[in-house]
Interface confidence: medium
Amino acid sequence: TLNSVLNSNAIKNLPPPLGGAAGHPGSAVSAAPGILYPGGNKYQTIDNYQPYPCAEDEECGTDEYCASPTRGGDAGVQICLACRKRRKRCMRHAMCCPGNYCKNGICVSSDQNHFRGEIEETITESFGNDHSTLDGYSRRTTLSSKMYHTKGQEGSVCLRSSDCASGLCCARHFWSKICKPVLKEGQVCTKHRRKGSHGLEIFQRCYCGEGLSCRIQKDHHQASNSSRLHTCQRH
């Protein structure tokens, strides 16, 4: 049986004033319990952290990699794990924190001068490949500086909302992240009501635009819980 598509307004980097400083958790203004805010690279409820499910390293943040949480655990259950610092054991570049790479099973510091020329030439072609090569590693550390001299248009691949043009945010879509429109009045938004209800979210939505908040549609108050529709409405 096909599971339901799950959506989210929880974008990793909310731009001010909707969030905190870029790259930091959004402020919990007029928050209800269980509403999701970006916290690091996990979906953070006000009183709860949830591991982020993944299938590839690309699905995780720059300080994370995708792996089974338990050694020798079920390969089908993978989450984003914190990257490994210098001198820690590794199996591929993605496991090592930015500024490091995996050499002979150990995370070692990268000589930026040594790598930079090669990275600059290969970054555009390499983006999205497995993290089993230097190219995969290089994508993590220099992607934003290489690819985003111009702001991304709708549908462009992005890492964070600041990579996108005005009126767009960076949101997950099919496990990639692309620039999507910030929601307008009347458009469907997603508000999570229960802890852990977000599941595997491949269709994130942007947040509601300025002066709007995500609230239950007036004519849907009587509807069953499962079909309640939230839309962006004036405060």
């Epitope: 049986t1 096909l2 599971n3 339901s4 799950l6 299938a55 690309e58 999205g128 692309i178 599941g199």
Partner: antibody, heavy 116, light 111 residues
């Protein structure tokens, strides 16, 4: 200009095999998930398969599971669909599509006819 | 399983507005949030017209709009033109595993 060009279609007998290719250009191929969608003559659209940007994550419609294999070669900017144990009901135009903002770009399709 | 139901055909005169509905089964209410619409002219590839229920990709005329209420998504075409005559498909996605479902399609005839 985003372009997707399918090839490899043709006439094949039931039980036979065929490999479709989709050459992509005009965008960074390795940054996008890709899909195959088919359309039987005079019928509607049916999603067949999807593949992640690196190829390590693949998904199939129940109707083709175990018979079709989706793959990609990012160095060649090419998407593939290996079709084995073909049946008459697999007869269709096969489209490759980019999974950007949904299925935002499609090729013109290649016709696969399964008949004895 | 997810099922999307569309009317087989609709028609309208030039300048009129028409609406095509797409109804999801109750089992996919949660998954029916993300709905897209595609236009397909005979012998041509489908074209994305609306994504996430109401968003138009760049280049798509603002005569096309989408909405959703309860279990039904709708595509409205205002100021109908001859070139709008085509088949229209709604579509949604399911996850774990990833899968996509299309409606049966609606043939739009411009009288």
């Amino acid at each position: 200009q985003v372009q997707l060009v399918e090839s490899g279609g043709g006439l094949v007998q039931p039980g036979g095999s065929l490999r479709l290719s989709c050459a992509a250009s005009g965008f960074t191929f390795s940054s996008y998930w890709m899909s195959w969608v088919r359309q039987a003559p005079g019928k509607g659209l049916e999603w067949v398969s999807g593949i992640s940007y690196s190829g390590s994550n693949t998904h199939y419609a129940d109707s083709v599971k175990g018979r079709f294999t989706i793959s990609r070669d990012n160095s060649k900017n090419t998407l593939y669909l290996q079709m084995n144990s073909l049946r008459a009901e697999d007869t269709a135009v096969y489209y490759c599509a980019r999974m950007g903002i949904d299925l935002d770009y499609w090729g013109q399709g290649t016709l696969v006819t399964v008949s004895s | 399983d997810i099922a999307l139901t569309q009317p087989a055909s609709v028609s309208g005169s030039p300048g009129q507005s028409i609406t095509i509905s797409c109804t999801g089964t109750s089992s996919d209410v949660g998954g029916f949030n993300y709905v897209s619409w595609y236009q397909q002219h005979p012998g041509k590839a489908p074209k994305l017209m609306i994504h996430d229920g109401s968003n138009r990709p760049s280049g798509v005329s603002n005569r096309f709009s989408g909405s959703k209420s309860g279990n039904t998504a709708s595509l409205t075409i205002s100021g109908l033109q001859a070139e709008d005559e085509a088949d229209y498909y709604c579509q949604t996605w399911a996850t774990s595993p990833l899968s996509s479902v299309f409606g049966g399609g609606t043939k739009l005839t411009v009288l």
